[in-house]
Interface confidence: low
């Protein structure tokens, strides 16, 4: 599923991401834009043999099990395929664990490079939330 900007903002708010660990909703929508272009089925291969999955591009070396990543920790205790669902519950729950891990949203390279320090509220402007 490819979400619309406001559609995703509403879904993320419903799942409790607004101001989760101090990160406003705009941060999460911005991260999703630059990680996956709002596509729940996005997958991207990394040079270390791991793969990033879903709307927030969650990594198989640490957070989910895809059965093919050497030394995978599966800290969210889910199959990576769950992160590709049009229902973003699994991605949100895992993202909450990631953002609580010490580095905050710096765990998402796209957020660090494209969203951090920018006007992230622009990503929810005009949305009925």
């Amino acid at each position: 599923k490819v979400f619309g900007r406001c559609e995703l903002a509403a879904a993320m708010k419903r799942h409790g991401l607004d101001n989760y660990r101090g990160y406003s909703l705009g941060n999460w929508v911005c991260a999703a834009k630059f990680e996956s272009n709002f596509n729940t089925q996005a997958t991207n291969r990394n040079t270390d043999g791991s793969t990033d999955y879903g709307i927030l591009q969650i990594n198989s070396r640490w957070w989910c099990n895809d059965g093919r990543t050497p030394g995978s920790r599966n800290l969210c205790n889910i199959p990576c395929s769950a992160l590709l669902s049009s229902d973003i519950t699994a991605s949100v729950n895992c993202a909450k664990k990631i953002v609580s891990d010490g580095n905050g949203m710096n765990a998402w390279v796209a957020w660090r490079n494209r969203c951090k320090g920018t006007d992230v509220q622009a990503w929810i402007r005009g949305c009925r939330l």
Partner: antibody
Framework: QVQLQESGAEVMKPGASVKISCKAT????????IEWVKQRPGHGLEWIGE????????YYNEKFKGKATFTADTSSNTAYMQLSSLTSEDSAVYYC?????????WGQGTTLTVSS | DIELTQSPATLSVTPGDSVSLSCRAS??????LHWYQQKSHESPRLLIK???QRASGIPSRFSGSGSGTDFTLSINSVETEDFGMYFC?????????FGGGTKLEIK
């Protein structure tokens, strides 16, 4: 237990297309990549590519782009590989395997013969 | 693409002998190297994963070692059921590649 059951041997004419199936049982089909491997006598084993059934995401060996197309039907836990514009070079045994980086589980192989 | 070179191409041994098969990678692949056995008209069977971990159900006479570019599969006291082809495969990068194989035959 994990099993991969491939479709039977095929004899095809040059220029035709063929679709090989691989039915998976004994595990969560959507969670693991299905790999496809070609074996020709004297040519060893060649990795064709892979599909993640849960998303339909595919990765192809550059050498097989345009030759092989992967699909998966999650309702029947079956992966498919279509080979197009067949030539004698495509005559081989084709295996599906469950992708774990290494391949612990393999299908029994499908023998494809391309002959006029 | 990473090339895997196996040697020797053929190894003739007597049951009871101990043997070593080599697999060399064209660039470093850490420990992401796996070994398979294949008998005539059968599918490959995983023996060793990640260079040194025996797969489930594999007898202890099979062992693997190596890291980086040089890897070895050792069979301690070969049994008659061990004869066949042996392939290495890397999972360090895409495309996945296999070695050309070593044929283990009875002398």
């Amino acid at each position: 237990q994990v099993q991969l059951q491939e479709s039977g041997a095929e004899v095809m004419k040059p220029g035709a297309s063929v679709k090989i199936s691989c039915k998976a049982t004994g595990y969560t089909f959507t969670t693991y990549w299905i790999e496809w491997v070609k074996q020709r006598p004297g040519h060893g084993l060649e990795w064709i590519g892979e599909i993640l059934p849960g998303s339909g995401s595919t990765y192809y060996n550059e050498k097989f782009k345009g030759k092989a197309t992967f699909t998966a039907d999650t309702s029947s836990n079956t992966a498919y590989m279509q080979l197009s514009s067949l030539t004698s070079e495509d005559s081989a045994v084709y295996y599906c395997a469950r992708g774990d980086g290494h391949y612990c589980y393999w299908g029994q192989g499908t023998t494809l013969t391309v002959s006029s | 693409d990473i090339e895997l070179t196996q040697s020797p191409a053929t190894l003739s041994v007597t049951p009871g002998d101990s043997v070593s098969l080599s697999c060399r990678a064209s660039q470093s692949i850490s420990n992401n190297l796996h070994w398979y056995q294949q008998k005539s008209h059968e599918s490959p069977r995983l023996l060793i994963k990640y260079a040194s971990q025996r797969a489930s159900g594999i007898p202890s006479r099979f062992s693997g070692s190596g890291s980086g570019t040089d890897f070895t599969l050792s069979i301690n006291s070969v049994e008659t059921e061990d004869f066949g082809m042996y392939f290495c495969q890397q999972s360090n990068s895409w495309p996945r590649t296999f070695g050309g194989g070593t044929k283990l035959e009875i002398k």
